[in-house]
């Protein structure tokens, strides 16, 4: 069946060194346990995280994300998943694309991450 993929409309903000969560869902909501779900980074489609056949596919990850990501699946039965990225880096700033694939049908949603320096202060005046 067809669905839409929905992600945040506004940029998500994170501090360097912190962790950040990128939510993504399908509409209408349905069980996505059997779907392929993933995040990649345009424009070169580097794989941030991939979930397929009921498990995370660590081998397909881009090296810079290996060991830093986790797919939160507590609501996957409703078609809702969250990508957690640990130890956020400045290089993580920019666009991410979330996708759900059900057999041959795939939809995706773009989102943006803004990374800020916790030690950068602008002195007033």
């Amino acid at each position: 069946g067809q669905f839409r993929v929905i992600g945040p409309r506004h940029p998500i903000r994170a501090l360097v060194g912190d962790e950040v969560e990128l939510p993504c869902r399908i509409s209408p909501g349905k069980n996505a346990t059997g779907m392929e779900v993933g995040w990649y980074r345009p424009p070169f489609s580097r794989v941030v995280h991939l979930y397929r056949n009921g498990k995370d596919q660590d081998g397909d990850q881009a090296p810079e994300y290996r060991g830093r990501t986790e797919l939160l699946k507590d609501a996957i039965g409703e078609g809702k998943v969250t990508l957690r990225i640990r130890n956020v880096r400045f290089s993580d700033e920019g666009g991410f694309t979330c996708f759900f694939r059900d057999h041959s049908y795939q939809e995706e949603a773009a989102m943006e991450l803004k990374v800020e320096d916790p030690f950068y202060w602008v002195s007033p005046g």
């Epitope: 945040p8 409309r9 903000r13 950040v20 969560e21 939510p23 509409s27 507590d74 609501a75 969250t82």
Partner: antibody, heavy 119, light 107 residues
């Protein structure tokens, strides 16, 4: 079972302060953006404020900006609303509501707590 | 801020009637719209999300349609339990505005 339980409402004089709490249970609290929505007696619903799951982003209706502060303690599964410089027009039932990832809607609400601002 | 205008404000109907409530947004909100039902003294209940998707556990007599600026909530055959106030809500921006409500009362 998902539960949201508000507390802290009561009678306060104009210009006074009040702190509302919303205790959450039965779900992964940090995965949900949370909002406060109020309803004046006999009136419609008015969104007041929202906070992201991490607590890093907060949003306010123009009517409360600068007077109200939303916060959360994910270790205690609790949402807060600090209300200062209260006015008669802030009199309402205040509900907390959850919103998955900040990209869904208010699928669970608390039972509400009444705030009355009067001298 | 985006304004949401519901019509009618009050609707008198009988059990079995087909009921339609309209919600208009002051600017396009794509499909970022929900419908809620509220009964006196109770918290609102989510019925429809993303303009047309039925929330889990909600009877199929409720349906939603529309996108952009014009949306409708339809109850195909009004039941005694459906007499309540209905609100639309936009979530296109972080100012989550509600419509003023439509009270469905017994004719």
């Amino acid at each position: 079972e998902v539960q949201l339980l508000e507390s802290g409402g009561g009678l306060v004089q104009p210009g006074g302060s009040l702190r509302l709490s919303c205790a959450a249970s039965g779900f992964t609290f940090s995965s949900y953006a949370m909002s406060w929505v109020r309803q004046a007696p006999g009136k419609g619903l008015e969104w007041v404020s929202a906070i992201s799951g991490s607590g890093g982003s907060t949003y306010y209706a123009d009517s409360v900006k600068g007077r109200f502060t939303i916060s959360r303690d994910n270790s205690k599964n609790t949402l807060y609303l600090q209300m200062n410089s209260l006015r008669a027009e802030d009199t309402a039932v205040y509900y907390c509501a959850r919103d998955w990832g900040g990209i869904y809607y208010f699928d669970y609400w608390g039972q509400g707590t009444l705030v009355t601002v009067s001298s | 801020d985006i304004q949401m205008t519901q019509s009618p404000s009050t609707l008198s109907a009988s059990v079995g009637d087909r009921v339609t409530i309209t919600c208009r947004a002051s600017q396009s909100i794509s499909s970022w719209l929900a419908w809620y039902q509220q009964k006196p003294g109770k918290a609102p209940k989510l019925l429809i999300y993303d303009a047309s998707s039925l929330e889990s556990g909600v009877p199929s007599r409720f349906s939603g349609s529309g996108s952009g600026t014009e949306f409708t909530l339809t109850i195909s055959s009004l039941q005694p339990d459906d007499f309540a106030t209905y609100y639309c809500q936009q979530k296109d921006t972080w100012s989550y505005t509600f419509g003023q409500g439509t009270k469905v009362e017994i004719k």
